[in-house]
């Protein structure tokens, strides 16, 4: 039993992970001309009690994490993007014209517990 | 087996749930003078594919949800507070003086998939 517990993989805390999104994989290559994909990243990991400062949390997340520690029916805070940036994309409009547009909130720059 | 499947509770989509935090339950009653607790609320629920408009998501969340639909190793977007408000609390400072302070991001006003 002790060995089994040791073997249990420790979940890493909330952080940014690499993710390249190829538009052909998600069926967007029929309307996005360029780029063919982009580095989106994603957030994943534990939001453990107590929430450390680097987990970039809100007062509510701190309270919710505290409540979860005494009442597991209330979920822990969740690891999500807290800072996002834009990318430019060329897309085909309804007339098959190529249009350059800036798309907000496409790339994860930072993660946190919320 | 069919009955069992019917009985399986459908997970509801991301929304705000009631949560009253009693400061004595979380051990904060020794430094918070008033109020004795507050309605914090919390966010919980599915962020299903495709993300509906009311789920108040970002472009990144839409992309991540789409990626998850073709690659389940990438997690779905998470239901988190997207709008928070402040409350005022009386607390005891290090000199045992009662201080009134406004605490930001304490109450969930809205949830979304992020």
């Amino acid at each position: 039993q002790a060995k089994h517990k040791q073997r249990k993989r420790l979940k890493s805390s909330c952080k940014r992970h690499p993710l390249y999104v190829d538009f052909s994989d998600v069926g967007w290559n029929d309307w996005i001309v360029a780029p063919p994909g982009y580095h989106a990243f994603y957030c994943h990991g534990e939001c453990p009690f107590p929430l450390a400062d680097h987990l970039n949390s809100t007062n509510h997340a701190i309270v919710q994490t505290l409540v979860n520690s005494v009442n597991s029916k209330i979920p822990k805070a969740c690891c999500v993007p807290t800072e996002l940036s834009a990318i430019s994309m060329l897309y085909l409009d309804e007339n098959e014209k190529v249009v350059l547009k800036n798309y907000q909130d496409m790339v994860v720059e930072g993660c946190g517990c919320r | 087996q069919a009955k069992h499947k019917q009985r399986k509770r459908l997970k509801s989509s991301c929304k705000r749930h009631p949560l009253y935090v009693d400061f004595s339950d979380v051990g904060w009653n020794d430094w918070i003078v008033a109020p004795p607790g507050y309605h914090a609320f919390y966010c919980h629920g599915e962020c299903p594919f495709p993300l509906a408009d009311h789920l108040n998501s970002t472009n990144h969340a839409i992309v991540q949800t789409l990626v998850n639909s073709v690659n389940s190793k990438i997690p779905k977007a998470c239901c988190v507070p997207t709008e928070l408000s402040a409350i005022s609390m009386l607390y005891l400072d290090e000199n045992e003086k009662v201080v009134l302070k406004n605490y930001q991001d304490m109450v969930v006003e809205g949830c979304g998939c992020r």
């Epitope: 190829d22 052909s24 290559n29 001309v33 360029a34 780029p35 190529v98 | -």
Partner: antibody, heavy 121, light 108 residues
Framework: QVQLQESGPGLVKPSETLSLTCTVS????????WSWIRQPPGKGLEWIGY???????RYNPPLKSRVTISVDTSKNQFSLKLSSVTAADTAVYYC???????????????WGQGTLVTVSS | EIVLTQSPGTLSLSPGERATLSCRAS???????LAWYQQKPGQAPRLLIY???SRATGIPDRFSGSGSGTDFTLTISRLEPEDFAVYYC?????????FGGGTKVEIK
Amino acid sequence: QVQLQESGPGLVKPSETLSLTCTVSGDSISSYYWSWIRQPPGKGLEWIGYIYYSGSTRYNPPLKSRVTISVDTSKNQFSLKLSSVTAADTAVYYCARICSSTSCWGWFDPWGQGTLVTVSS
Amino acid sequence: EIVLTQSPGTLSLSPGERATLSCRASQSVSSSYLAWYQQKPGQAPRLLIYGASSRATGIPDRFSGSGSGTDFTLTISRLEPEDFAVYYCQQYGSSPLTFGGGTKVEIK
């Protein structure tokens, strides 16, 4: 510097499938779109289609039903297949690179030297 | 699709003269997404101009591009012997990508 070289049979019978390969040297095939363009003897240029290393393609609508462009990243090659050919498909076939970013998308540079494919029985 | 019409079909000039080639689009080319190429007999086309007015790497400054919307021009300020060739315009502001029919610049 990047160089492109077309290869394949110079003579194809009507109703058969034309198959050409473009070998890319001096650059990874993984960073750009790769295109096919053709030029009938004494005539102008016609874009056929392009591919990204992931397999994402876009084709010229009049040719779409007959065209398949594929990629082999391990060999740094991409290929063209044109089915049910007729004499009207006789042309010099060129492969070329298209930049895949928003700041430089859409023009062809560089080009292969071209290969003449004649459709005749 | 956008149809590109080049004029004149043939331009007969002497070395040292100025050449003005026209490319007219059947509809507006968005963001001046237009390129010019030079093709000599038995050779592949070579990129000269992209974005209507930007010279490609290694292209002499006697070549210049201008225009927007539906009317575009390639100008060769002083023709050199090696400039006698066929010139094509190409638009990439709409799908499918299309080329003009070409203008042949020949020695007078």
